[in-house]
Interface confidence: low
Protein backbone atom coordinates (compact mmCIF):
# COMPACT_ATOMS: atom_id res chain seq x y z
CA UNK A 1 0.00 0.00 0.00
CA UNK A 2 2.75 1.85 0.10
CA UNK A 3 3.28 3.46 3.21
CA UNK A 4 6.46 3.09 4.99
CA UNK A 5 6.75 1.80 8.52
CA UNK A 6 8.01 3.12 12.04
CA UNK A 7 7.59 0.67 14.66
CA UNK A 8 7.41 1.94 18.16
CA UNK A 9 8.79 0.39 21.58
CA UNK A 10 5.80 -1.40 23.94
CA UNK A 11 3.72 0.77 25.89
CA UNK A 12 2.58 -0.74 29.17
CA UNK A 13 -0.67 0.32 30.63
CA UNK A 14 -2.47 -0.05 33.50
CA UNK A 15 -6.49 -1.39 32.64
CA UNK A 16 -9.21 0.42 34.13
CA UNK A 17 -7.99 4.31 33.46
CA UNK A 18 -7.28 6.78 30.87
CA UNK A 19 -4.85 6.26 28.21
CA UNK A 20 -4.14 8.39 25.33
CA UNK A 21 -1.25 8.07 22.63
CA UNK A 22 -0.47 11.02 20.14
CA UNK A 23 0.59 10.08 17.08
CA UNK A 24 3.27 12.32 15.90
CA UNK A 25 7.02 11.93 14.23
CA UNK A 26 8.13 15.34 13.68
CA UNK A 27 9.09 16.42 10.84
CA UNK A 28 6.18 14.33 9.10
CA UNK A 29 3.08 15.39 11.54
CA UNK A 30 4.70 19.04 11.57
CA UNK A 31 2.87 19.75 7.85
CA UNK A 32 -0.29 19.11 6.51
CA UNK A 33 -1.22 15.66 7.28
CA UNK A 34 -4.33 13.39 7.90
CA UNK A 35 -4.08 11.31 11.01
CA UNK A 36 -5.74 7.80 11.00
CA UNK A 37 -5.72 5.20 13.96
CA UNK A 38 -6.84 1.62 13.02
CA UNK A 39 -6.55 -1.34 15.69
CA UNK A 40 -4.95 -4.41 14.36
CA UNK A 41 -4.55 -4.07 10.75
CA UNK A 42 -8.22 -3.57 10.95
CA UNK A 43 -10.06 -1.64 7.50
CA UNK A 44 -11.50 0.20 9.39
CA UNK A 45 -10.42 3.34 11.08
CA UNK A 46 -10.95 4.13 15.32
CA UNK A 47 -13.89 5.87 15.77
CA UNK A 48 -14.11 9.77 16.11
CA UNK A 49 -17.23 9.91 18.42
CA UNK A 50 -16.11 11.70 21.03
CA UNK A 51 -18.68 9.52 23.42
CA UNK A 52 -17.08 6.43 22.08
CA UNK A 53 -15.04 4.68 24.95
CA UNK A 54 -11.94 3.83 22.05
CA UNK A 55 -11.89 7.03 20.10
CA UNK A 56 -9.72 9.64 18.05
CA UNK A 57 -9.40 12.60 19.03
CA UNK A 58 -7.42 15.00 16.21
CA UNK A 59 -4.11 13.26 16.08
CA UNK A 60 -4.59 11.46 19.37
CA UNK A 61 -6.12 7.86 20.48
CA UNK A 62 -7.85 8.07 23.63
CA UNK A 63 -9.35 5.38 25.60
CA UNK A 64 -11.76 6.05 28.88
CA UNK A 65 -11.27 4.35 30.11
CA UNK A 66 -8.52 1.47 29.01
CA UNK A 67 -9.79 -2.01 29.64
CA UNK A 68 -8.66 -5.96 29.33
CA UNK A 69 -9.24 -6.47 25.68
CA UNK A 70 -7.60 -3.38 24.68
CA UNK A 71 -4.07 -5.23 24.65
CA UNK A 72 -3.05 -5.00 20.95
CA UNK A 73 -1.09 -3.25 17.93
CA UNK A 74 -2.54 -0.22 16.69
CA UNK A 75 -1.20 1.92 13.42
CA UNK A 76 -1.58 4.91 13.13
CA UNK A 77 -2.00 6.22 9.73
CA UNK A 78 -0.32 9.41 8.60
CA UNK A 79 -1.09 11.01 5.16
CA UNK A 80 0.05 13.87 3.52
CA UNK A 81 -0.14 14.95 -0.15
CA UNK A 82 2.34 13.12 -1.50
CA UNK A 83 3.14 10.69 1.30
CA UNK A 84 2.02 7.95 3.73
CA UNK A 85 3.39 6.65 6.90
CA UNK A 86 2.46 3.93 9.49
CA UNK A 87 3.66 4.37 13.28
CA UNK A 88 2.45 0.57 15.26
CA UNK A 89 1.98 0.89 19.03
CA UNK A 90 1.96 -2.33 20.69
CA UNK A 91 -0.17 -1.34 23.47
CA UNK A 92 0.09 -4.21 27.14
CA UNK A 93 -2.57 -3.72 29.33
CA UNK A 94 -2.17 -5.55 32.59
CA UNK A 95 -4.20 -5.24 35.68
CA UNK A 96 -2.24 -3.36 38.44
CA UNK A 97 -3.92 -2.97 41.82
CA UNK A 98 -1.18 -0.13 43.20
CA UNK A 99 -1.44 -0.87 47.29
CA UNK A 100 -1.55 -4.64 46.89
CA UNK A 101 1.75 -5.64 48.07
CA UNK A 102 1.22 -9.01 46.41
CA UNK A 103 1.08 -8.20 43.24
CA UNK A 104 4.41 -7.73 41.33
CA UNK A 105 5.33 -4.40 39.97
CA UNK A 106 5.31 -2.87 36.55
CA UNK A 107 6.85 -5.15 33.74
CA UNK A 108 9.37 -3.46 31.79
CA UNK A 109 8.93 0.08 33.71
CA UNK A 110 9.78 3.01 31.25
CA UNK A 111 12.06 6.16 32.21
CA UNK A 112 8.71 8.13 33.12
CA UNK A 113 7.48 5.31 35.97
CA UNK A 114 11.56 4.84 37.44
CA UNK A 115 12.57 8.22 38.59
CA UNK A 116 15.48 9.52 41.18
CA UNK A 117 16.11 11.49 43.71
CA UNK A 118 19.32 12.82 44.97
CA UNK A 119 20.11 12.39 48.51
CA UNK A 120 20.44 15.69 50.76
CA UNK A 121 19.61 18.05 47.91
CA UNK A 122 15.95 19.37 47.18
CA UNK A 123 14.55 17.52 43.97
CA UNK A 124 11.73 16.54 42.50
CA UNK A 125 9.55 13.51 41.00
CA UNK A 126 7.39 14.45 37.49
CA UNK A 127 3.60 13.02 37.33
CA UNK A 128 3.69 12.25 33.02
CA UNK A 129 0.26 13.28 31.93
CA UNK A 130 -0.02 12.90 28.15
CA UNK A 131 -3.88 13.74 27.17
CA UNK A 132 -5.10 15.71 24.27
CA UNK A 133 -6.94 19.68 24.74
CA UNK A 134 -10.04 18.13 25.45
CA UNK A 135 -9.08 16.49 28.52
CA UNK A 136 -8.97 18.58 31.39
CA UNK A 137 -6.67 17.50 34.46
CA UNK A 138 -7.71 18.43 38.49
CA UNK A 139 -4.93 19.06 40.93
CA UNK A 140 -2.46 16.46 41.18
CA UNK A 141 -2.26 14.68 44.56
CA UNK A 142 0.75 12.84 45.26
CA UNK A 143 0.66 8.95 47.19
CA UNK A 144 3.79 7.03 49.02
CA UNK A 145 2.92 3.12 50.02
CA UNK A 146 -0.31 4.27 49.68
CA UNK A 147 -0.68 7.03 51.89
CA UNK A 148 -1.26 10.80 50.66
CA UNK A 149 2.21 12.47 51.11
CA UNK A 150 1.80 15.19 53.49
CA UNK A 151 4.05 17.57 55.28
CA UNK A 152 7.02 20.61 55.04
CA UNK A 153 9.29 18.77 53.07
CA UNK A 154 6.86 18.21 49.97
CA UNK A 155 5.55 20.78 47.88
CA UNK A 156 3.11 20.13 44.89
CA UNK A 157 4.12 22.11 41.80
CA UNK A 158 1.41 21.65 38.58
CA UNK A 159 2.85 18.30 37.56
CA UNK A 160 5.70 18.02 39.91
CA UNK A 161 6.35 16.69 43.44
CA UNK A 162 9.21 18.63 44.84
CA UNK A 163 11.35 17.17 48.01
CA UNK A 164 12.86 19.26 50.09
CA UNK A 165 16.32 17.88 51.98
CA UNK A 166 15.77 14.09 49.82
CA UNK A 167 16.43 11.10 52.68
CA UNK A 168 16.96 7.88 52.15
CA UNK A 169 13.46 6.44 53.33
CA UNK A 170 12.10 8.58 50.67
CA UNK A 171 12.82 5.69 48.30
CA UNK A 172 9.88 3.68 47.71
CA UNK A 173 6.71 3.07 45.78
CA UNK A 174 5.22 6.18 44.71
CA UNK A 175 1.74 6.91 42.81
CA UNK A 176 0.65 10.23 41.71
CA UNK A 177 -3.37 10.91 40.97
CA UNK A 178 -5.26 13.22 38.86
CA UNK A 179 -8.98 13.35 38.13
CA UNK A 180 -9.37 13.69 34.11
CA UNK A 181 -12.68 15.45 32.72
CA UNK A 182 -13.75 14.43 29.74
CA UNK A 183 -17.11 15.57 27.63
CA UNK A 184 -18.46 16.03 31.44
CA UNK A 185 -17.23 12.46 32.71
CA UNK A 186 -14.26 11.77 35.14
CA UNK A 187 -11.93 9.35 35.23
CA UNK A 188 -9.00 8.54 37.75
CA UNK A 189 -5.42 8.64 35.88
CA UNK A 190 -3.22 6.98 38.89
CA UNK A 191 0.49 6.54 37.47
CA UNK A 192 3.29 4.32 40.05
CA UNK A 193 6.50 5.60 39.84
CA UNK A 194 9.37 3.75 41.79
CA UNK A 195 11.61 6.25 43.22
CA UNK A 196 15.62 5.23 43.97
CA UNK A 197 17.94 7.53 45.99
CA UNK A 198 21.66 8.61 44.61
CA UNK A 199 23.96 9.19 47.10
CA UNK A 200 25.54 12.85 46.92
CA UNK A 201 29.82 12.93 46.28
CA UNK A 202 31.44 11.23 49.73
CA UNK A 203 33.65 13.95 51.55
CA UNK A 204 30.69 16.44 52.32
CA UNK A 205 31.54 17.79 48.23
CA UNK A 206 28.62 18.59 46.38
CA UNK A 207 27.67 17.10 43.03
CA UNK A 208 28.46 18.91 39.87
CA UNK A 209 25.13 19.95 38.05
CA UNK A 210 25.22 18.79 34.24
CA UNK A 211 23.41 21.77 32.55
CA UNK A 212 23.29 19.97 29.31
CA UNK A 213 22.94 17.24 27.70
CA UNK A 214 19.69 16.29 29.36
CA UNK A 215 19.85 12.83 28.46
CA UNK A 216 18.13 13.27 25.35
CA UNK A 217 18.21 12.22 21.75
CA UNK A 218 19.51 14.73 18.75
CA UNK A 219 18.55 14.31 14.83
CA UNK A 220 21.42 14.16 13.03
CA UNK A 221 22.16 13.04 9.47
CA UNK A 222 24.78 10.33 8.29
CA UNK A 223 27.98 11.68 7.40
CA UNK A 224 27.56 15.23 9.06
CA UNK A 225 30.28 16.69 11.65
CA UNK A 226 28.82 17.15 15.55
CA UNK A 227 29.63 18.93 17.90
CA UNK A 228 28.12 18.37 21.32
CA UNK A 229 29.24 20.36 24.66
CA UNK A 230 28.99 19.14 27.80
CA UNK A 231 28.04 21.95 30.19
CA UNK A 232 28.97 21.86 34.16
CA UNK A 233 28.47 23.93 37.05
CA UNK A 234 30.90 22.80 39.75
CA UNK A 235 32.02 24.64 43.05
CA UNK A 236 35.29 26.73 42.67
CA UNK A 237 37.47 24.21 44.44
CA UNK A 238 36.41 21.17 43.11
CA UNK A 239 38.65 18.52 42.62
CA UNK A 240 36.09 16.61 39.74
CA UNK A 241 37.06 15.28 36.61
CA UNK A 242 35.35 16.03 33.44
CA UNK A 243 35.19 13.79 30.37
CA UNK A 244 33.30 11.70 28.09
CA UNK A 245 32.33 8.01 27.70
CA UNK A 246 30.89 5.52 25.61
CA UNK A 247 30.67 1.92 26.18
CA UNK A 248 32.49 2.95 29.29
CA UNK A 249 35.92 3.98 28.09
CA UNK A 250 37.14 7.29 27.31
CA UNK A 251 35.92 8.43 23.20
CA UNK A 252 39.72 9.10 22.89
CA UNK A 253 41.05 5.58 24.24
CA UNK A 254 37.40 3.97 22.53
CA UNK A 255 38.37 5.61 19.21
CA UNK A 256 42.15 5.71 19.53
CA UNK A 257 42.84 4.62 15.90
CA UNK A 258 40.03 5.96 13.87
CA UNK A 259 40.45 9.71 15.95
CA UNK A 260 36.75 9.95 14.57
CA UNK A 261 35.25 11.08 17.96
CA UNK A 262 37.45 13.14 20.04
CA UNK A 263 36.93 14.88 23.06
CA UNK A 264 38.02 18.58 23.26
CA UNK A 265 40.10 20.63 25.46
CA UNK A 266 38.11 22.04 28.71
CA UNK A 267 37.36 25.60 29.15
CA UNK A 268 35.68 27.46 32.02
CA UNK A 269 34.18 30.91 32.82
CA UNK A 270 34.24 31.33 36.72
CA UNK A 271 31.61 33.49 38.17
CA UNK A 272 31.66 34.77 41.83
CA UNK A 273 30.25 30.49 43.97
CA UNK A 274 30.70 28.63 40.63
CA UNK A 275 32.63 27.43 37.66
CA UNK A 276 30.96 27.00 34.17
CA UNK A 277 33.07 24.40 32.69
CA UNK A 278 32.91 23.12 28.64
CA UNK A 279 34.59 20.15 27.74
CA UNK A 280 33.02 19.23 23.76
CA UNK A 281 32.85 15.99 21.77
CA UNK A 282 33.47 15.87 18.24
CA UNK A 283 32.03 13.69 15.64
CA UNK A 284 33.86 14.39 12.52
CA UNK A 285 32.01 12.35 10.52
CA UNK A 286 28.71 10.24 12.06
CA UNK A 287 28.27 6.96 10.97
CA UNK A 288 25.39 4.41 11.42
CA UNK A 289 27.39 2.56 14.16
CA UNK A 290 26.76 6.16 16.16
CA UNK A 291 23.14 5.99 16.02
CA UNK A 292 21.35 4.23 19.26
CA UNK A 293 24.65 4.51 21.31
CA UNK A 294 24.55 6.55 24.71
CA UNK A 295 27.19 9.07 24.69
CA UNK A 296 28.03 9.73 28.47
CA UNK A 297 29.18 13.24 29.62
CA UNK A 298 30.48 12.34 33.31
CA UNK A 299 31.16 15.25 35.79
CA UNK A 300 32.69 13.61 38.97
CA UNK A 301 29.34 11.22 40.08
CA UNK A 302 26.75 13.42 37.33
CA UNK A 303 26.56 11.69 34.44
CA UNK A 304 24.24 12.81 31.25
CA UNK A 305 23.74 11.26 27.56
CA UNK A 306 22.85 12.29 24.26
CA UNK A 307 21.68 9.40 22.05
CA UNK A 308 22.29 10.09 18.80
CA UNK A 309 18.95 9.57 16.49
CA UNK A 310 18.59 8.99 12.46
CA UNK A 311 16.29 12.24 10.93
CA UNK A 312 13.34 10.53 9.15
CA UNK A 313 13.47 11.02 6.08
CA UNK A 314 12.40 13.95 3.58
CA UNK A 315 8.97 12.51 3.25
CA UNK A 316 7.38 15.40 0.75
CA UNK A 317 9.26 13.80 -2.35
CA UNK A 318 7.65 10.92 -2.86
CA UNK B 1 25.05 -19.09 12.00
CA UNK B 2 22.81 -16.75 10.43
CA UNK B 3 20.66 -19.13 7.58
CA UNK B 4 17.71 -19.03 5.32
CA UNK B 5 17.09 -21.93 3.06
CA UNK B 6 13.98 -22.01 0.67
CA UNK B 7 12.24 -24.80 -0.64
CA UNK B 8 9.35 -25.58 -3.00
CA UNK B 9 10.27 -24.69 -6.38
CA UNK B 10 10.29 -26.94 -9.09
CA UNK B 11 8.11 -27.00 -12.78
CA UNK B 12 4.85 -25.80 -12.98
CA UNK B 13 2.30 -25.56 -15.71
CA UNK B 14 1.17 -21.77 -16.32
CA UNK B 15 -2.17 -20.93 -14.43
CA UNK B 16 -0.60 -23.33 -11.84
CA UNK B 17 0.01 -22.61 -8.01
CA UNK B 18 3.26 -23.71 -6.63
CA UNK B 19 4.03 -22.61 -2.09
CA UNK B 20 7.37 -21.31 -1.24
CA UNK B 21 8.95 -22.13 1.55
CA UNK B 22 12.09 -20.38 3.56
CA UNK B 23 13.04 -21.71 6.83
CA UNK B 24 15.30 -18.92 9.28
CA UNK B 25 17.63 -19.74 12.00
CA UNK B 26 20.28 -18.20 13.77
CA UNK B 27 18.42 -15.01 14.13
CA UNK B 28 14.98 -13.00 15.95
CA UNK B 29 12.69 -14.10 13.42
CA UNK B 30 10.05 -12.03 14.66
CA UNK B 31 12.45 -9.15 14.59
CA UNK B 32 13.00 -8.96 11.30
CA UNK B 33 10.86 -7.68 8.09
CA UNK B 34 11.44 -10.23 5.32
CA UNK B 35 11.27 -10.23 1.46
CA UNK B 36 10.95 -12.52 -1.70
CA UNK B 37 12.83 -11.25 -4.69
CA UNK B 38 13.56 -13.22 -7.97
CA UNK B 39 15.84 -13.17 -10.87
CA UNK B 40 14.62 -14.25 -14.00
CA UNK B 41 17.03 -16.10 -16.22
CA UNK B 42 19.77 -13.88 -17.35
CA UNK B 43 17.91 -10.93 -15.90
CA UNK B 44 18.34 -8.24 -13.08
CA UNK B 45 16.72 -8.47 -9.96
CA UNK B 46 13.04 -8.06 -8.57
CA UNK B 47 11.12 -7.69 -5.72
CA UNK B 48 8.39 -9.62 -4.92
CA UNK B 49 6.90 -9.08 -1.82
CA UNK B 50 7.66 -8.26 2.10
CA UNK B 51 6.20 -8.94 5.17
CA UNK B 52 6.78 -7.35 8.44
CA UNK B 53 7.87 -8.71 11.63
CA UNK B 54 4.33 -9.34 13.30
CA UNK B 55 3.20 -10.53 10.02
CA UNK B 56 0.47 -7.91 10.28
CA UNK B 57 1.02 -5.76 7.22
CA UNK B 58 2.03 -6.86 3.54
CA UNK B 59 3.26 -5.36 0.64
CA UNK B 60 3.73 -6.61 -2.84
CA UNK B 61 5.21 -5.68 -6.70
CA UNK B 62 2.50 -4.45 -8.54
CA UNK B 63 3.68 -7.58 -11.36
CA UNK B 64 2.26 -10.10 -8.89
CA UNK B 65 -0.09 -8.58 -6.95
CA UNK B 66 -3.62 -10.27 -6.31
CA UNK B 67 -1.97 -13.64 -7.49
CA UNK B 68 1.01 -14.32 -5.07
CA UNK B 69 0.43 -14.26 -1.01
CA UNK B 70 3.13 -13.02 1.30
CA UNK B 71 2.89 -15.16 5.03
CA UNK B 72 4.89 -16.18 7.84
CA UNK B 73 4.49 -18.55 10.72
CA UNK B 74 6.50 -17.03 13.51
CA UNK B 75 6.39 -19.95 15.77
CA UNK B 76 7.80 -22.40 12.56
CA UNK B 77 10.31 -19.28 11.70
CA UNK B 78 9.19 -19.92 8.23
CA UNK B 79 8.62 -17.54 5.31
CA UNK B 80 6.02 -18.24 2.76
CA UNK B 81 5.01 -16.94 -0.58
CA UNK B 82 1.81 -19.00 -2.06
CA UNK B 83 1.81 -18.19 -5.70
CA UNK B 84 -1.46 -18.35 -7.92
CA UNK B 85 -2.79 -18.49 -11.52
CA UNK B 86 1.51 -19.05 -12.14
CA UNK B 87 2.47 -16.89 -15.89
CA UNK B 88 5.45 -17.99 -17.74
CA UNK B 89 6.75 -14.17 -16.92
CA UNK B 90 6.85 -15.57 -13.01
CA UNK B 91 9.76 -18.23 -13.96
CA UNK B 92 12.79 -17.08 -12.02
CA UNK B 93 15.55 -18.12 -9.28
CA UNK B 94 12.99 -16.98 -5.72
CA UNK B 95 15.49 -15.95 -3.39
CA UNK B 96 13.96 -15.12 0.15
CA UNK B 97 15.76 -12.51 2.44
CA UNK B 98 15.97 -10.97 5.48
CA UNK B 99 15.34 -6.79 5.70
CA UNK B 100 18.34 -5.46 7.93
CA UNK B 101 17.21 -3.25 10.99
CA UNK B 102 18.51 -0.30 12.62
CA UNK B 103 17.14 0.13 16.13
CA UNK B 104 17.14 3.93 16.85
CA UNK B 105 16.47 4.99 20.43
CA UNK B 106 14.65 8.21 21.34
CA UNK B 107 13.41 9.75 24.61
CA UNK B 108 10.89 6.88 24.82
CA UNK B 109 10.60 5.15 21.56
CA UNK B 110 12.58 3.16 19.55
CA UNK B 111 12.70 3.71 15.77
CA UNK B 112 13.15 0.82 13.98
CA UNK B 113 14.80 1.51 10.86
CA UNK B 114 14.37 -1.37 7.84
CA UNK B 115 17.12 -1.25 5.42
CA UNK B 116 18.76 -3.29 2.40
CA UNK B 117 18.34 -7.27 3.07
CA UNK B 118 21.29 -8.25 4.62
CA UNK B 119 20.64 -12.11 4.78
CA UNK B 120 19.83 -13.90 1.53
CA UNK B 121 19.01 -17.73 0.98
CA UNK B 122 20.20 -19.67 -1.90
CA UNK B 123 17.47 -19.21 -3.84
CA UNK B 124 15.13 -21.54 -5.48
CA UNK B 125 14.19 -22.06 -9.10
CA UNK B 126 10.71 -21.82 -10.43
CA UNK B 127 9.36 -22.77 -14.01
CA UNK B 128 6.32 -22.13 -15.25
CA UNK B 129 5.91 -24.29 -18.63
CA UNK B 130 3.46 -26.35 -20.59
CA UNK C 1 6.33 3.26 -7.85
CA UNK C 2 10.18 4.81 -7.87
CA UNK C 3 12.22 4.36 -11.35
CA UNK C 4 15.78 3.34 -10.54
CA UNK C 5 18.15 4.02 -13.40
CA UNK C 6 21.83 2.60 -12.92
CA UNK C 7 24.92 3.49 -15.45
CA UNK C 8 26.57 2.13 -17.01
CA UNK C 9 24.99 -1.25 -17.98
CA UNK C 10 28.67 -2.60 -18.56
CA UNK C 11 32.11 -1.81 -18.03
CA UNK C 12 36.03 -3.19 -19.13
CA UNK C 13 38.18 -2.65 -15.96
CA UNK C 14 41.23 -3.58 -14.70
CA UNK C 15 43.06 -4.35 -11.26
CA UNK C 16 43.81 -1.66 -9.45
CA UNK C 17 41.65 0.59 -11.39
CA UNK C 18 39.30 2.76 -9.70
CA UNK C 19 35.27 2.09 -10.51
CA UNK C 20 32.43 4.21 -10.38
CA UNK C 21 28.80 3.09 -10.86
CA UNK C 22 25.91 5.79 -10.83
CA UNK C 23 22.04 5.26 -9.67
CA UNK C 24 19.96 7.53 -10.19
CA UNK C 25 16.19 7.55 -8.38
CA UNK C 26 12.99 9.13 -10.52
CA UNK C 27 12.26 11.06 -7.43
CA UNK C 28 14.18 11.98 -3.91
CA UNK C 29 14.81 8.80 -1.72
CA UNK C 30 16.66 10.62 0.74
CA UNK C 31 19.73 8.43 1.73
CA UNK C 32 16.87 5.03 1.84
CA UNK C 33 19.42 3.16 -1.37
CA UNK C 34 21.35 0.08 -1.35
CA UNK C 35 24.00 -1.71 -3.31
CA UNK C 36 24.50 -5.37 -4.08
CA UNK C 37 27.04 -7.86 -5.46
CA UNK C 38 25.86 -10.52 -7.28
CA UNK C 39 28.33 -13.56 -9.16
CA UNK C 40 26.94 -16.35 -11.24
CA UNK C 41 24.91 -18.48 -10.14
CA UNK C 42 25.18 -16.87 -6.31
CA UNK C 43 22.63 -14.80 -3.67
CA UNK C 44 23.16 -10.91 -4.29
CA UNK C 45 25.31 -9.69 -1.24
CA UNK C 46 24.48 -6.13 0.29
CA UNK C 47 27.59 -3.97 0.23
CA UNK C 48 26.17 -0.48 0.83
CA UNK C 49 23.22 0.45 3.22
CA UNK C 50 21.76 3.34 4.03
CA UNK C 51 23.55 5.20 1.12
CA UNK C 52 27.36 5.05 2.59
CA UNK C 53 27.46 2.94 5.04
CA UNK C 54 29.33 -0.63 5.17
CA UNK C 55 27.69 -3.97 5.74
CA UNK C 56 30.04 -5.62 7.97
CA UNK C 57 32.41 -7.78 6.28
CA UNK C 58 32.82 -5.48 2.97
CA UNK C 59 36.13 -4.74 2.42
CA UNK C 60 36.80 -0.80 2.67
CA UNK C 61 37.76 0.29 -0.83
CA UNK C 62 33.55 -0.23 -1.52
CA UNK C 63 32.24 3.30 -0.70
CA UNK C 64 28.89 4.59 -1.36
CA UNK C 65 27.58 8.51 -1.07
CA UNK C 66 24.84 11.00 -2.51
CA UNK C 67 21.23 11.43 -1.19
CA UNK C 68 18.07 12.53 -3.08
CA UNK C 69 18.23 11.09 -6.52
CA UNK C 70 21.59 10.98 -7.38
CA UNK C 71 23.95 7.89 -6.02
CA UNK C 72 27.47 6.29 -6.35
CA UNK C 73 29.02 3.38 -5.66
CA UNK C 74 32.72 3.54 -5.81
CA UNK C 75 35.52 0.94 -6.12
CA UNK C 76 38.87 2.30 -4.78
CA UNK C 77 41.25 -0.17 -5.87
CA UNK C 78 39.66 -2.96 -8.42
CA UNK C 79 40.54 -6.70 -7.02
CA UNK C 80 39.98 -10.32 -9.35
CA UNK C 81 37.26 -10.48 -6.77
CA UNK C 82 34.97 -7.69 -7.67
CA UNK C 83 34.57 -8.63 -11.07
CA UNK C 84 30.12 -8.93 -10.88
CA UNK C 85 27.21 -7.56 -11.53
CA UNK C 86 25.97 -4.55 -9.16
CA UNK C 87 22.62 -3.86 -8.52
CA UNK C 88 21.43 -0.80 -6.36
CA UNK C 89 18.10 -1.00 -4.49
CA UNK C 90 15.99 1.93 -2.86
CA UNK C 91 14.08 0.78 0.26
CA UNK C 92 12.34 4.06 0.82
CA UNK C 93 8.71 2.85 -0.05
CA UNK C 94 7.08 -0.10 -0.85
CA UNK C 95 7.59 -1.10 -3.94
CA UNK C 96 11.17 -2.00 -3.49
CA UNK C 97 12.70 -1.58 -6.51
CA UNK C 98 15.91 -2.27 -7.73
CA UNK C 99 18.35 -0.68 -10.74
CA UNK C 100 18.52 -3.09 -13.56
CA UNK C 101 22.39 -3.46 -12.67
CA UNK C 102 26.01 -3.04 -13.91
CA UNK C 103 28.20 -5.83 -14.96
CA UNK C 104 32.11 -5.28 -14.15
CA UNK C 105 34.05 -7.28 -16.49
CA UNK C 106 37.90 -7.46 -17.02
CA UNK C 107 39.56 -5.74 -19.42
Known amino acids: DGCKDIFMKNEILSASQPFAFNCTFPPITSGEVSVTWYKNSSKIPVSKIIQSRIHQDETWILFLPMEWGDSGVYQCVIKGRDSCHRIHVNLTVFEKHWCDTSIGGLPNLSDEYKQILHLGKDDSLTCHLHFPKSCVLGPIKWYKDCNEIKGERFTVLETRLLVSNVSAEDRGNYACQAILTHSGKQYEVLNGITVSITERAGYGGSVPKIIYPKNHSIEVQLGTTLIVDCNVTDTKDNTNLRCWRVNNTLVDDYYDESKRIREGVETHVSFREHNLYTVNITFLEVKMEDYGLPFMCHAGVSTAYIILQLPAPDFRAY | EVQLLESGGGLVQPGGSLRLSCAAS????????MSWVRQAPGKGLEWVSGISGSGANTYYADSVKGRFTISRDNSKNTLYLQMNSLRAEDTAVYYC???????????????????????WGQGTLVTVSS | DIQMTQSPSSLSASVGDRVTITCRAS??????LNWYQQKPGKAPKLLIYIASNLQSGVPSRFSGSGSGTDFTLTISSLQPEDFATYYCQQTYTTPYTFGGGTKVEIK
Open chain 2, 97 to 119: ARDGIVVVPAANHSYYYYYGMDV
Open chain 2, 26 to 33: GFTFTSHA
Open chain 3, 27 to 32: QSISVH
